[in-house]
């Protein structure tokens, strides 16, 4: 997960945009990525970076938990 997120974040050369990406990686079981992104007001660049990293992180976590379940069987 960390490697993939670092790969994505490396595209963003504006520090705030990069940090928006990292914010998207934080675990939040109560809201979707879209719901969280809707509260961002600093600009569409931040929304895009946040959403991209949030979605990728969510997918990777889902895949990993799925693998864990398979191994558990």
């Amino acid at each position: 997960l960390q490697e993939k997120i670092e790969e994505i974040a490396a595209k963003y050369k504006h520090l705030v945009v990069k940090k928006c990406c990292y914010d998207g990686v934080r675990i939040n079981h109560d809201e979707t990525c879209e719901q969280r992104a809707a509260r961002i007001s600093v600009g569409p660049r931040c929304v895009k970076a946040f959403t991209e990293c949030c979605v990728v992180a969510s997918q990777l976590r889902a895949n990993n938990s799925h693998k864990d379940l398979q191994l558990g069987r």
Epitope: H14, L15, V16, S41, G43, R45
Partner: antibody, heavy 118, light 111 residues
Amino acid sequence: QVQLVQSGAEVKKPGSSVKVSCKASGYTFTDHIIHWMRQAPGQGLEWMGYIYPREGWTNYNENFKGRVTITADKSTSTAYMELSSLRSEDTAVYYCARERNLEYFDYWGQGTTVTVSS
Amino acid sequence: DIVLTQSPASLAVSPGQRATITCKASQSVDYEGFNYMNWYQQKPGQPPKLLIYAASNLDSGVPARFSGSGSGTDFTLTINPVEAEDTANYYCQQSLEDPHTFGGGTKVEIK
């Protein structure tokens, strides 16, 4: 209407520090990044750094080698720029500006003249 | 760092004529089709004022005689026709990445 109002002119001795303020009004202070630039007499614009008040995130121009610190007080909607170890070459007009959409500077402060002289 | 090179450093234009200023970036400021290049006008004793953002978008209240064009690494600010009040310094600026950088400026004088 959006306004950025900066503190008044300063005269400082070499080796001392200066702290310039930038009070924002007319918009939600935490929604936009505040940048600081400076302009030496007869010269162009030099970017110094910024702060995103909502998160406290900062980034600085490496040319200032740790001499610059940017802070923000959300309770008063004011950003501050402190420059230490002043030298004569730091004599300049210092500007704050709001960055809109992480794209461009749409509002600027009126500028603060800092003179460094022994 | 992205270095912005403006030319010419100064130019004198007669009223009614066209003034053209160029800004060349050391690397592309285009990201996914959006050009993070802006233009500002600065008159003596005043802060800079936004003219053009995203390479070609005129800021509100800016006269239509100002226009911007270009993409990637090469950008142009055009004033046509020039008026006496356009005497000022003009700066390009990129916001794609940190550190944000400005061009060296172009001084426009009216003959």
